[in-house]
């Protein structure tokens, strides 16, 4: 807290300008009117205030707006945003995408801070859903943003927003998140033709069920091994050797390099060795000829 002291004669600030950088902390407190500061916030960024001076300016705004800053002030906070705590930000009501962009710009190039996370949370909750423009903005600043959301939060993403998602935005997503995003992507891209559809849906396939993979295998998509390895194990296991061969096309020979990695390893164990041999890749570990496979899980379900 800065002590309340009278402003020295002739030092009362008429506007926010460079002369203020020579003011001591107590002079800033005494000589700068909070209402003036609020209306001229856009000038603060152009002035090389010290961190201590910025603390004083923040204190003045806090006194003027104890219930939270209005958006007109928030939009022009600039580097003063870095002084805000998540508790401060929870009092705000940010509705403009321009305001959001302005504040994200301040933190650009850095990890997502607790302040930024709180700001985004407030903004998205205020909008009710993660619309395309917001998603575009957030992933531009933080490519990993989408994957930082819980499956519950992702459920509020409308299918139309999926068009804004780039492959790199999904790099750190786990299967639970892709389980939520995949049906939305399937819906979003449903009117595209085969090859174009595959290019768009490819990054989301970690959430695809078996029946969709079977359908893809009929479309000459030539899935690469990196994509195949990201598929859900439970979705891959029921695929036949013929279906996997069609799904991978010329990339099928890559199964050899990944034969000990899941889901390839688990899939091999489920196939008849005779069928695996037809691939000519030397894949071993399939079910020997003459053995009967009992699906015990199916038996339990029936009893």
């Amino acid at each position: 807290e800065v002590e309340k002291t009278a402003c020295p004669s002739g030092k009362k600030a008429r506007e926010i300008d460079e002369s203020l950088i020579f003011y001591k902390k107590w002079e800033l407190e005494a000589c700068v009117d909070a209402a003036l500061l609020a209306t001229q916030m856009d000038r603060v960024n152009a002035i090389p205030f010290t961190y201590e001076q910025l603390d004083v300016l923040k204190h003045k705004l806090d006194e003027l707006y104890p219930q939270g800053y209005p958006e007109s002030v928030i939009q022009h906070l600039g580097y003063l945003f870095l002084k805000m705590s998540p508790e401060d930000i929870r009092k705000w009501n940010v509705t403009s995408l321009e305001t959001l962009k302005a504040l994200l710009e301040v933190n650009k190039g850095h990890e997502m801070s607790p302040q930024v996370a709180t700001l985004i949370d407030r903004f998205v909750k205020g909008r009710g859903q993660l619309d395309k423009d917001t998603l575009d903005t957030l992933t531009a600043f933080y490519p990993g943003y989408l994957c930082s959301l819980s499956p519950e939060e992702l459920s509020s993403v409308p299918p139309s927003s999926i068009w804004a998602v780039r492959p790199q935005d999904l790099d750190t997503c786990d299967p639970r998140q892709l389980d939520v995003l995949y049906p939305k992507a399937r819906l979003a891209f449903q009117n595209m033709n085969g090859s174009e559809y595959f290019v768009k849906i490819q990054s989301f396939l970690g959430g695809a069920p078996t029946e969709d993979l079977k359908a893809l295998s009929q479309q000459n998509v030539s899935m690469d091994l990196a994509t195949f390895m990201k598929l859900r194990t439970d979705a891959v296991l029921p695929l036949t050797v013929a279906e996997v061969q069609k799904l991978l096309g010329p990339h099928v020979e890559g199964l050899k390099a990944e034969e000990r990695h899941r889901p390839v390893r688990d899939w091999i164990l489920r196939q008849r060795q005779d069928d695996l041999d037809t691939l000519g890749l030397g894949l071993q570990g399939g079910i020997p000829n003459g053995y009967l496979v009992l699906d015990l899980s199916m038996q339990e379900a029936l009893s």
Partner: antibody
Framework: EVQLQQSGPELVKPGASVKIPCKAS????????MDWVKQSRGKSLEWIGD????????IYNQKFEGRATLTVDKYSSTAYMELRGLTSEDTAVYFC????????????WGTGTTVTVSS | QLVLTQSPAIMSASPGEKVTLTCSAS???????LSWYLQKPGSSPKLWIY???NLASGVPARFSGSGSGTSYSLTISSMEAEDAASYFC?????????FGGGTKLEIK
């Protein structure tokens, strides 16, 4: 430019452990496997194992099974190899190497980390 | 494990000379699964040839690779000073992946 940056030399005591980082840049780490290779002084290369960064699934050369652990932090695009119970036989240069998933050759190699085990 | 034996262990060649390095496998390896790496002192290995005969990006055309089954080779049609290095063959046909002992090629 695709690069795999490894840490500087390590001097460790027998019985101790070492964890070597390999920072990937210029590509998406989850789209390729990351393998690790040992090279003892003046000797050939020895494959330790590999990890698929997307799901962290790792496989090992039986010789290193139980002593080596391969992990990945997707968020920082960094792969790690931890080797435990070190002996003088583990004195070597350790390389991380990128492997295009579905192939068995290493198209980009790390800078190498020299580990010296000595009391 | 599948053993790869390289010969000779060390050899020297004059500039312009044709050079052949060999790699012999203890059991059959599909040609898709054999590659070669070059390594210079103090540096990391570099992919040089993959799938027996495909040159990696940036490898001069004087290099070639051939072979099948248990016998593979790397050939330099006309030796140059910059080709002096150690060459390692590598197989990924069976686990664990293995490398040959290497051939150190020197310039005369």
């Amino acid at each position: 430019e695709v690069q795999l940056q490894q840490s500087g030399p390590e001097l460790v005591k027998p019985g101790a452990s070492v964890k070597i980082p390999c920072k990937a840049s210029g590509y998406t780490i989850t789209d390729y496997n990351m393998d690790w290779v040992k090279q003892s002084r003046g000797k050939s290369l020895e494959w330790i194992g590999d990890v698929f960064p997307y799901n962290g699934d790792s496989i090992y050369n039986q010789k290193f099974e139980g002593r080596a652990t391969l992990t990945v932090d997707k968020y920082s695009s960094t792969a790690y190899m931890e080797l435990r119970g070190l002996t003088s036989e583990d004195t070597a240069v350790y390389f991380c190497a990128r492997r295009k998933t579905g192939t068995g050759y290493f198209d980009v190699w790390g800078t190498g980390t020299t580990v010296t085990v000595s009391s | 494990q599948l053993v790869l034996t390289q010969s000779p262990a060390i050899m020297s060649a004059s500039p312009g000379e044709k050079v052949t390095l060999t790699c012999s496998a203890s059991s059959s390896v599909s040609s898709t699964y054999l590659s070669w790496y070059l390594q210079k002192p103090g540096s990391s290995p570099k992919l040089w040839i993959y799938s027996t005969s495909n040159l990696a990006s940036g490898v001069p055309a004087r290099f070639s690779g051939s072979g099948s089954g248990t016998s593979y080779s790397l050939t330099i049609s006309s030796m140059e000073a910059e080709d002096a290095a150690s060459y390692f063959c590598h197989q990924w046909s069976s686990y664990p992946y293995t490398f040959g002992g290497g051939t150190k090629l020197e310039i005369k």
